[in-house]
């Protein structure tokens, strides 16, 4: 049994998350994950799910009763989702920590928007000429 | 020229994001995107970046001066990042809108944690037996 299982069961007790009523009104994550089979689509969704759990764990980090469980699960996420790659985890954390209400952050984000957009689709990696054919060819003339 | 470019320039004016000082203290997103070449890694990062922009746009949705620009850019993101797939966009939006402080959401999230964790690594897709060899076979006895 993977080590996170025991610790997740401990969290379930702490949050009363084993009660039958928890399943009411569908799932948060599981149905969404079932919808997406492609690895890149899954990563888009899992990225949001992992950031949710990290925020949740942060809110309870000082509670001694679940500290060990939280630490074990976070370590497991780092091995499985981030491939034990601290640089990947650090970059991810930076992105999740930007404040959308900070005017300096807003200005930077808008300043970078054109370049971010240019890289959004996988096609962006196959060279400018090919990409422009892909998109321009699919767009009505302006 | 892609349609978002003109609208992003309009946003730059609105946010004074063309000023030279905006580039101080490094980039928010661009340096991070440069670090990641693998498509699945890029999606992990872009997922957070796109959710940041969506939050930013939400905060300014009632400002008439930039409404058209914001809508054009959002449409372009939907084409490029979500492949014009409304279900993908809807699932993404659901994930970004969950409140981490809502106790019902917390309970559901903890209830689903074991299954979410089981699917986190790409290895999870190659069948339970093979995956257990990858991780369990490489773990010391507890």
């Amino acid at each position: 049994q993977d080590p996170y299982v025991k610790e997740a069961e401990n969290l379930k007790k702490y949050f009363n998350a084993g009660d039958p009523d928890v399943a009411d009104n569908g799932t948060l994550f599981l149905d969404i994950l079932r919808n997406w089979k492609e690895e890149s689509d899954r990563k888009i969704m899992q990225s949001q799910i992992v950031s949710f759990y990290f925020k949740l764990f942060k809110n309870f980090k000082d509670d001694q009763r679940i500290q060990k469980s939280v630490e074990t699960i976070k370590e497991d996420i780092n091995v499985k989702f981030f491939n034990s790659n601290k640089k990947k985890r650090d970059d991810f954390e930076k992105l999740t920590n930007y404040s959308v209400t900070d005017s300096n952050v807003q200005r930077k984000a808008v300043h970078e928007l054109i370049q971010v957009m240019a890289e959004l689709s996988p096609a962006a990696k196959i060279g400018k000429r090919k990409r422009s054919q892909m998109f321009r060819g699919r767009r009505a003339s302006q | 020229q892609d349609p978002y470019v003109k609208e992003a320039e309009n946003l730059k004016k609105y946010f004074n994001a063309g000023d030279p000082d905006v580039a101080d203290n490094g980039t928010l997103f661009l340096d991070i995107l440069r670090n990641w070449k693998e498509e699945s890694d890029r999606k992990i990062m872009q997922s957070q970046i796109v959710s940041f922009y969506f939050k930013l746009f939400k905060n300014f949705k009632d400002d008439q001066r930039i409404q058209k620009s914001v809508e054009t850019i959002k449409e372009d993101i939907n084409v490029k990042f979500f492949n014009s797939n409304k279900k993908k966009r809807d699932d993404f939006e659901k994930l970004t809108n969950y409140s981490v402080t809502d106790s019902n959401v917390q309970r559901k999230a903890v209830h689903e944690l074991i299954q979410v964790m089981a699917e986190l690594s790409p290895a999870a897709k190659i069948g339970k037996r093979k995956r257990s060899q990858m991780f369990r076979g490489r773990r010391a006895s507890q």
Epitope: D2, P3, Y4, K68, V70, E71, T72, K74, E75, D76, N78, V79, N83, S84, N85, K86, K87, K88, R89, D90, E93 | R34, N35, W36, K37, E38, D41, F135, R138, R139, A140, Q142
Partner: antibody
Framework: EVQLVESGGGLVKPGDSLTVSCVAS????????IHWVRQAPGKGLEWVAT????????FYSDSLRGRFTVSRDNAANSVYLHMSSLRGEDTALYYC?????????????????WGRGTLVTVSS | NFMLTQPLSVSGYPGKTIVISCVRS????????VQWFQQRPGSAPAMVIY?????PSGIPDRFSGSVDASSNSASLTISGLKTEDEADYFC??????????FGGGTKLTVL
């Protein structure tokens, strides 16, 4: 003060097995990955294996997987490297090195703290 | 096969600046942190740079690290060279899931 102390090295014959140990102190042991790194006389550094903190996942150098097994006892603040079917080229100083705390995004640097090493000599 | 390639030896005069390169053979150097270690004869390696460009406490600012994605390499720069800097220097990074990789080492001689 962070300390890592290796022991259990010695002279063994080719084909024999040996387990070297590392006892750690000065930090919350169970939170940290631990690496084994070796250095043959007059040669460079070679990574051998890593074991994660609470989850105890094991990672091995491709060239050594199958012959070497890493394990840990968090209650005893100890990590072990079991080496079997030893060969002359396994002769080296074996270092125990502290890795990241992967449960903490502000973890101290990986491979910052090294033990002094324990010498394993494989010879007939 | 993943490799980190360093020059076998580098030399410089006291007070001068030397650069040791570390070229990654495959995969992106920017996708994993790079560390640098100094090893004097008879001692365990000691970290001089971690996470690309950071110095552990006690390491003087004469030591600096950088990563260049265009050449897929990392560099250790030592300025104001001192005789005590004479040692072997190893770069280190990662591949796969927590697979640790060391460069072959560079012998620094202070002339």
């Amino acid at each position: 003060e962070v300390q890592l102390v290796e022991s259990g090295g010695g002279l063994v014959k080719p084909g024999d097995s040996l387990t070297v140990s590392c006892v750690a102190s000065g930090f919350t042991f169970s939170n940290y990955f631990i690496h084994w790194v070796r250095q043959a006389p007059g040669k460079g550094l070679e990574w051998v294996a890593t074991i994660s903190g609470r989850t105890k996942y094991m990672f091995y150098s491709d060239s050594l997987r199958g012959r070497f097994t890493v394990s840990r006892d968090n209650a005893a603040n100890s990590v072990y490297l079991h080496m079997s079917s030893l060969r002359g080229e396994d002769t080296a100083l074996y270092y125990c090195v502290r890795g990241y705390d992967h449960s903490d995004s502000n973890s101290a640097a990986d491979l910052l703290h090294w033990g002094r090493g324990t010498l394993v000599t494989v010879s007939s | 096969n993943f490799m980190l390639t360093q020059p076998l030896s580098v030399s410089g005069y006291p007070g001068k600046t030397i650069v040791i390169s570390c070229v990654r053979s495959s995969g992106s150097v920017a996708s994993h942190y790079v560390q640098w270690f100094q090893q004097r004869p008879g001692s365990a390696p000691a970290m001089v740079i971690y996470e690309d460009s950071h110095r552990p406490s006690g390491i003087p600012d004469r030591f600096s690290g950088s990563v260049d994605a265009s050449s897929n390499s990392a560099s250790l720069t030592i300025s104001g060279l001192k005789t005590e800097d004479e040692a072997d220097y190893f770069c280190q990074s990662y591949y796969g899931n927590n697979q640790v990789l060391f460069g072959g080492g560079t012998k620094l001689t202070v002339l």
